[in-house]
């Protein structure tokens, strides 16, 4: 998930040279930007979130807000400061004319301004309920730990907290920030107002139909009786959670956001801040049968984004739409005809569908995992959710063709035991946004702050790419893929792993002069090879084939085309051991795979040779996939021969630590 690559509308209003009477001019050369929702009907012009630079203090935020009001008044405009943000993001929420945007963008400390927009409950039909008999049986499901050490915050509609399913489990906070309902004839019927939130609270912690039956919940009302809210209301809700956390630190916190709006830079930024404060955020991918990266908070990289599947593990269709998909989705979960508490009566049940229900399942699973292991970080939790998911059960034909490779084929499941997974080396695959088609376009994939980038690969549907390389950015390694002339764009694919006490570096060999090809190995004592990348400047690598198999006794070596620079990811970590596994096919084939065996984790995936008919390589769970151009276009020349190279690792140190715990 890449929040910076979201497809949203950005209007950059250039700063004029005159200072318009400001006491402090903005820093030289910086331009504050204006953002608004790309989905026109969801825009809420007239209300703006003014986000200030990171270090801005509350007093400066208040001063900036007052300055805006004063300058607006001088121009004859009325403004109203609705909220001053602090705790998560510095800034303020202002009601004003759009005519004042240029003025506001020139204020000191302003980073960017975002027009407010709508967010929506992600269940269908959440107010056209199909009532099931008021009895529901879940005799089989008796979880080992009901999530009793965890508090789950639910940002949703109002809820009926004394429903038998959730009585005593949900504390309704006094937080409420919702827009007026649409329509003059709207009739506020309590049971409908509570429908969405009550159902989701039941899915998370309901006594009969809940996932984490022991979890306690707190609800914040950010959606009105029509299931509609605002980005600003959600932001203020997230800020409320952060302040509550600071005032009264408790155990692990999970925040469930069963809502979606258009891509929002500010909502994603707030989610990032809260996640970095140790809170686990789980959100609905959205019910728009679209790329989840176009929606927020689904597109926030730090949030666990959940798509919906049905009882047959197929993506959920919701009327003419359905679950969102794509690289911003972390995993899927049950989201069709989910039985849960109905606000129609205190013992009623109803089935609802949508990515909200799927997200509620994952929030419940997360609560149980955190209750069993309260010290888990967000990165560790996400890796475990992925690790314990059912793999490759979703029929990908439902997704648009260009999204299939990007969408994780994972359906959330409870771990067989909530303990004892500590020994595993966990890795996941992170896809970048598409680079775009320009000649010099690049795409960047990054790992989470406490994950290690162990390898980097690239993929292009046209095959026109110039490989990939690992490079340092802000003190962390990132994976960058390069487009080639005439290419339709590339993806960078990062393999992100949990490797405590790791010390990783990249060793590079420039293109070789000799015809033997380029080689690079890990020469530092105790460092093992975790991944190989290759990058070339030439538009089209020739048909030169390096020797595919490494010389014996050279497992720590990357081999590549002589015209390519080769990059080896070399890591030192306690007990880390890795081995190279290759699968070569002499005849041309569209896909070659090689998998790591039980107990080993795939850290690196690359292709040999790196010639132009190879579209790229990427990891799917523990399998390295190398894709080549359509056989019919390649012909059956020897150039068609491709080898998939997997690097499989395990950590004896983690295994020992786990055994000692047991």
């Amino acid at each position: 998930q890449e929040d910076e690559d979201g497809d949203y509308e950005e209007l950059v209003l250039a700063l004029r040279s005159e200072e318009d009477g400001l006491a402090e001019a903005p820093e030289h050369g910086t331009t504050a930007t204006f953002h608004r929702c790309a989905k026109d009907p969801w825009r809420l012009p007239g209300t703006y979130v003014v986000v200030l630079k990171e270090e801005t203090h509350l007093s400066q935020s208040e001063r900036t807000a007052r300055r805006l009001q004063a300058q607006a008044a001088r121009r004859g405009y009325l403004t109203k400061i609705l909220h001053v943000f602090h705790g998560l993001l510095p800034g303020f929420l202002v009601k004003m004319s759009g005519d004042l945007l240029e003025l506001a963008l020139k204020l000191p400390h302003v980073d960017y301004i975002e027009e407010d927009s709508s967010v929506f409950a992600q269940s269908i039909p959440w107010n056209l309920e199909r009532i099931t008999p008021p009895r529901y049986r879940a005799d089989e499901y008796q979880p080992p730990d009901g999530g009793s050490l965890v508090e789950v915050y639910l940002l949703d509609t109002s809820i009926q907290s004394d429903h038998r399913e959730i009585e005593g489990r949900v504390m309704v906070t006094d937080f409420e920030n919702v827009p007026e309902e649409d329509g003059t004839r709207f009739h506020r019927q309590a049971s409908k107002c509570d429908s969405h939130g009550t159902h989701l609270a039941g899915v998370v912690s309901g006594r009969d139909a809940g996932v984490a039956k022991g979890a306690s919940m707190r609800s914040l009302r950010v959606l009105n009786c029509q299931g509609k809210g605002t980005v600003s209301g959600t932001l203020i809700g997230l800020e409320f959670i952060r302040k509550s956390q600071l005032v009264q630190p408790v155990g692990p916190l999970v925040v469930l956001l069963p809502l979606a709006g258009g891509y929002s830079r500010v909502l994603n930024a707030a989610c990032q801040r809260l996640a970095r404060a140790g809170v686990v955020l789980v959100t609905a991918a959205g019910n728009f049968r679209d790329d989840a990266c176009l929606y927020s908070p689904a597109s926030a990289p730090e949030v666990i984004t959940v798509g919906a599947t049905n009882a047959q593990d197929q993506p959920v269709t919701l009327g003419t739409l359905g679950t969102n998909f794509g690289r911003c989705v972390d995993l899927f979960a049950p989201g069709e005809d989910i039985i849960g508490a109905s606000s129609d009566c205190s013992t009623c049940f109803v089935s609802q569908s949508g990515t909200s229900q799927a997200a509620a399942h994952v929030a419940g699973i997360a609560a149980m995992m955190l209750s069993a292991e309260p010290e888990l970080t967000l990165a560790e939790l996400r890796q475990r959710l992925i690790h314990f998911s059912a793999k490759d059960v979703i029929n990908e034909a439902w997704f648009p063709e260009d999204q299939r490779v990007l969408t994780p084929n994972l359906v959330a499941a409870l771990p067989p035991s909530t303990h004892g997974a500590g020994w595993q080396l966990f890795c996941r695959t992170v896809w970048s946004a598409h680079s775009g088609p320009t000649r010099m376009a690049t795409a960047v994939a990054r790992c989470a702050p406490d994950e290690e980038l162990l390898s980097c690969s690239s993929f292009s549907r046209s095959g026109k790419r110039r490989g990939e390389r690992m490079e340092a950015q802000g003190g962390k390694l990132v994976c960058r893929a390069h487009n080639a002339f005439g290419g339709e764009g590339v993806y960078a694919i990062a393999r992100c792993c949990l490797l405590p006490q790791a010390n990783c570096s990249v060793h590079t060999a420039p293109p070789a002069e000799a015809s033997m090809g380029t080689r690079v190995h890990c020469h530092q004592q105790g460092h093992v090879l975790t991944g190989c990348s290759s990058h070339w400047e030439v538009e089209d690598l020739g048909t030169h084939k390096p020797p595919v198999l490494r010389p014996r006794g050279q497992p720590n070596q990357c081999v590549g085309h002589r015209e390519a620079s080769i990059h080896a990811s070399c890591c030192h970590a306690p007990g880390l051991e890795c081995k190279v596994k290759e699968h070569g096919i002499p005849a041309p084939q569209e896909q070659v795979t090689v998998a790591c065996e039980e107990g080993w984790t795939l850290t690196g995936c690359s292709a040999l040779p790196g010639t132009s008919h190879v579209l790229g390589a990427y990891a799917v769970d523990n399998t390295c996939v190398v894709r080549s151009r359509d056989v019919s276009t390649t012909g059956s020349t020897s150039e068609g021969a491709v080898t998939a190279v997997a690097i499989c690792c395990r950590s004896r140190h983690l295994a020992q630590a786990s055994q000692e715990l047991q």
Epitope: R135, A138, D162, R164, E167, G168, S191, C345, T347
Partner: antibody, heavy 115, light 107 residues
């Protein structure tokens, strides 16, 4: 601490009505409804119904339908149970208890129906 | 309605005895069963919640077990203050229903 405090004993004539109150304290009242349970002299316990502090929803036992009304006043955290057309077999101790789980009980209110 | 059948209806025991009371539901109630102790002129007091969970303040000599339709309340070593009437109650479905009670008397 969590407490349910009920109103005092009542003596009523057959055909009259009685209204028993139950004041809740020490917890978030909207997180639980109130159940009413009665116990005739020397007999067992009988659940009469449930009422919501949150929205006033009710769930009555069939036996009570039509004669009993349960209400709440969230502003004072008080629940009420009114029983109309009293008969001698309504003589009992009436208890309020928290939620459906009946984990906390009031001290009981004795209602005597006698001509 | 779900019927709850308690046995025995009364028993005589001495201080220090191990006492077992059983409760059977007419249909599966999962583990949504509570046990109460009631002394004359007093309100029932919750002893066991959800078939086996002992609330804070309830002595450890009281324990509950069972799930589905068959449940047991055990007093491992009867104390003088334990002589009372014990009720089981299901809250799996409404109406909530009680067993007829078991009176524990001094032998």
């Amino acid at each position: 601490q969590v407490q349910l405090v009920q109103s005092g004993a009542e003596v009523k004539k057959p055909g009259a009505s009685v209204k028993v109150s139950c004041k809740a304290s020490g917890y978030t009242v909207t997180s639980y409804g109130i159940s009413w349970v009665r116990q005739a002299p020397g007999q067992g316990l009988e659940w009469m119904g449930w009422v919501s502090f949150y929205n006033g929803q009710t769930n009555y036992a069939q036996k009570l339908q039509g004669r009993g009304t349960m209400t709440t006043d969230p502003s004072t955290s008080t629940a009420y149970m009114e029983l109309r057309s009293l008969r001698s077999d309504d003589t009992a101790v009436y208890y309020c208890a928290r939620g459906y789980s009946l984990d906390v009980w009031g001290q009981g209110t004795t209602v005597t129906v006698s001509s | 309605d779900i019927q709850m059948t308690q046995s025995p209806s009364s028993l005589s025991a001495s201080v220090g005895d191990r006492v077992t009371i059983t409760c059977r539901a007419s249909q599966n109630i999962n583990n949504w069963l509570n046990w109460y102790q009631q002394k004359p002129g007093k309100a029932p007091k919750l002893l066991i919640y959800g078939a086996s969970t002992r609330p804070t303040g309830v002595p450890s000599r009281f324990s509950g077990s069972g799930s589905g339709t068959d449940f047991t309340l055990t007093i491992s070593s009867l104390q003088p203050e334990d002589f009372a009437t014990y009720y089981c109650q299901q809250w799996d479905d409404t109406p909530n229903t009680f067993g007829q009670g078991t009176k524990v008397e001094i032998k």
